[in-house]
């Protein structure tokens, strides 16, 4: 069965999951000067499947333009894809000093709220 | 002290909080036909104050355009302002039937994730 090809089941390909990317330490805003790259893991994707009745109605109201909300603080009508666990990341700075930053990278994600 | 006016302290006026609005039942997407209004409470506002080291670095990476993320699923670099408690809401439909919808309105908010 594992080798048989079949029609793909409908899955939320954009669903909440852990993603990773090589990024320059200099772009992390840590205040450490470094030319190194590190692997940064983060969470992104949709949490539509986990919506409550409140969320469904909120989405309906937002879609209908029926809710007034302050500029820049539009309410969120689904749980958020957020890290549930973190890990430390280490790198070498320009002075060849080994630096470790706790809770920098995500190691697990969940639909929260 | 309660009656004294003083120079405003810098506070997060746009912070995560409970808001309320009268909305038409017809805009709630419940499948019930009704021209009534109900009071709908929802959560909105910023959770910037609760950001972790991961969030700060994620925000820095996003700001620098250093992260690739799938269209429509940009990662969130702060906890989400979401309901932590809900309440039922009741209304009259067009047939004068009293309807109650559980968990429709928020009663408390928090910065989650």
């Amino acid at each position: 069965a594992g080798t048989r090809s079949s029609r793909a089941r409908t899955t939320d390909a954009r669903g909440c999951r852990l993603r990773s990317q090589l990024v320059p330490v200099s772009a992390l805003g840590l205040g450490h000067s470094s030319d190194e790259l590190i692997r940064f893991r983060f969470c992104s994707g949709s949490c539509r499947r986990a919506r409550s009745q409140h969320d469904l109605s909120l989405a309906s109201l937002l879609g209908a333009g029926a809710l007034r909300s302050p500029p820049g603080s539009r309410p969120i009508s689904q749980p958020c894809c957020r890290p549930t666990r973190y890990e430390a990341v280490s790198f070498m700075d320009v002075n060849s000093t080994w630096r470790t930053v706790d809770h920098l990278s995500a190691t697990a994600c969940g639909c929260l709220g | 002290a309660g009656t004294r006016s003083s120079r405003a302290r810098t506070t997060d006026a746009r912070g995560c909080r409970l808001r309320s609005q009268l909305v038409p039942v017809s805009a709630l997407g419940l499948g019930h036909s009704s021209d009534e209004l109900i009071r709908f409470r929802f959560c909105s506002g910023s959770c910037r104050r609760a950001r972790s080291q991961h969030d700060l670095s994620l925000a820095s990476l996003l700001g620098a355009g250093a992260l690739r993320s799938p269209p429509g699923s940009r990662p969130i670099s702060q906890p989400c302002c979401r309901p932590t408690r809900y309440e039922a809401v009741s209304f009259m439909d067009v047939n004068s039937t009293w309807r109650t919808v559980d968990h429709l309105s928020a009663t408390a908010c928090g910065c989650l994730g």
Epitope: - | L18, E36, L37, R39, V89, F91, M92, W98, T107
Partner: antibody, heavy 122, light 107 residues
Framework: EVQLVESGGDLVQPGGSLKLSCAAS????????MHWVRQASGKGLEWVGR??????????EYGASVKGRFTISRDDSKNTAYLQMNSLKIEDTAVYYC?????????????WGQGTMVTVSS | DIQMTQSPSSLSASVGDRVTITCRAS??????LNWYQQKPGKAPNLLIY???TLESGVPSRFSGSGSGTDFTLTISSLQPEDFEIYYC?????????FGQGTKVEIK
């Protein structure tokens, strides 16, 4: 647009009667309670009374100062509420507001009319 | 009847000031407390519902807090349009009652 419009305010002599109307538009109020609140010139707000919805058998309650003299009624088919005022006194002189209170675990005066002036004077 | 006592009855402040108005109930009313603003010649307008919920469309500089018998309305940074009269109101018991009002005036 959601609104309430009061009418019927007038100058009346002490001991006289007056009937105020409150018409709702832009929504249906049959599931809501209808309240009346008044405000004498330069004074604070005073709750007059309310009529509840059909589910609560259109029960009415009144403030102590008007009990036995004022009667609140409603006609849901016309989306209109009424305040019948009898045995009017000089101290009943005020702006009268009708207010919708939608159902909720905690209630508030949600939608206010613009007010209608009742003057009791000889 | 539940008595609602507001203080102060009036206050003078300047644009940009932080202002706090208090409301005390004669018995516990949980969070069955609403705040209204009234402009001259107009009906009151709901600002804060259920002690602390900001009514949509009301600026975020307004906030409410409290439970039981003691409540506060705070305006974090007074704006010119905020110089009006404010009322608290309880909906815990019939008859619903209001505070006597607080007039916020320009210093």
């Amino acid at each position: 647009e959601v609104q309430l419009v009061e009418s019927g305010g007038d100058l009346v002599q002490p001991g006289g009667s007056l009937k105020l109307s409150c018409a709702a538009s832009g929504f249906t109020f049959s599931g809501s309670a209808m309240h009346w609140v008044r405000q004498a010139s330069g004074k604070g707000l005073e709750w007059v009374g309310r009529i509840r919805n059909k589910v609560h058998r259109y029960a009415t309650e009144y403030g102590a100062s008007v009990k036995g003299r004022f009667t609140i009624s409603r006609d849901d088919s016309k989306n209109t509420a009424y305040l019948q005022m009898n045995s009017l006194k000089i101290e009943d002189t005020a702006v009268y507001y009708c207010v919708v209170v939608v159902p909720g675990s905690i209630e508030a005066f949600d939608i206010w009319g613009q007010g209608t002036m009742v003057t009791v004077s000889s | 009847d539940i008595q609602m006592t507001q203080s102060p009855s009036s206050l003078s402040a300047s644009v940009g000031d932080r202002v706090t108005i208090t409301c005390r109930a004669s018995q516990s009313i949980s969070t069955y407390l609403n705040w209204y603003q009234q402009k001259p010649g107009k009906a009151p307008n709901l600002l804060i519902y259920a002690a602390s919920t900001l009514e949509s469309g009301v600026p975020s500089r307004f906030s409410g807090s409290g439970s039981g018998t003691d409540f506060t309305l705070t305006i974090s940074s007074l704006q010119p349009e905020d110089f009006e009269i404010y009322y608290c109101q309880q909906s815990y018991n019939i008859p619903w009652t209001f505070g006597q009002g607080t007039k916020v005036e320009i210093k």
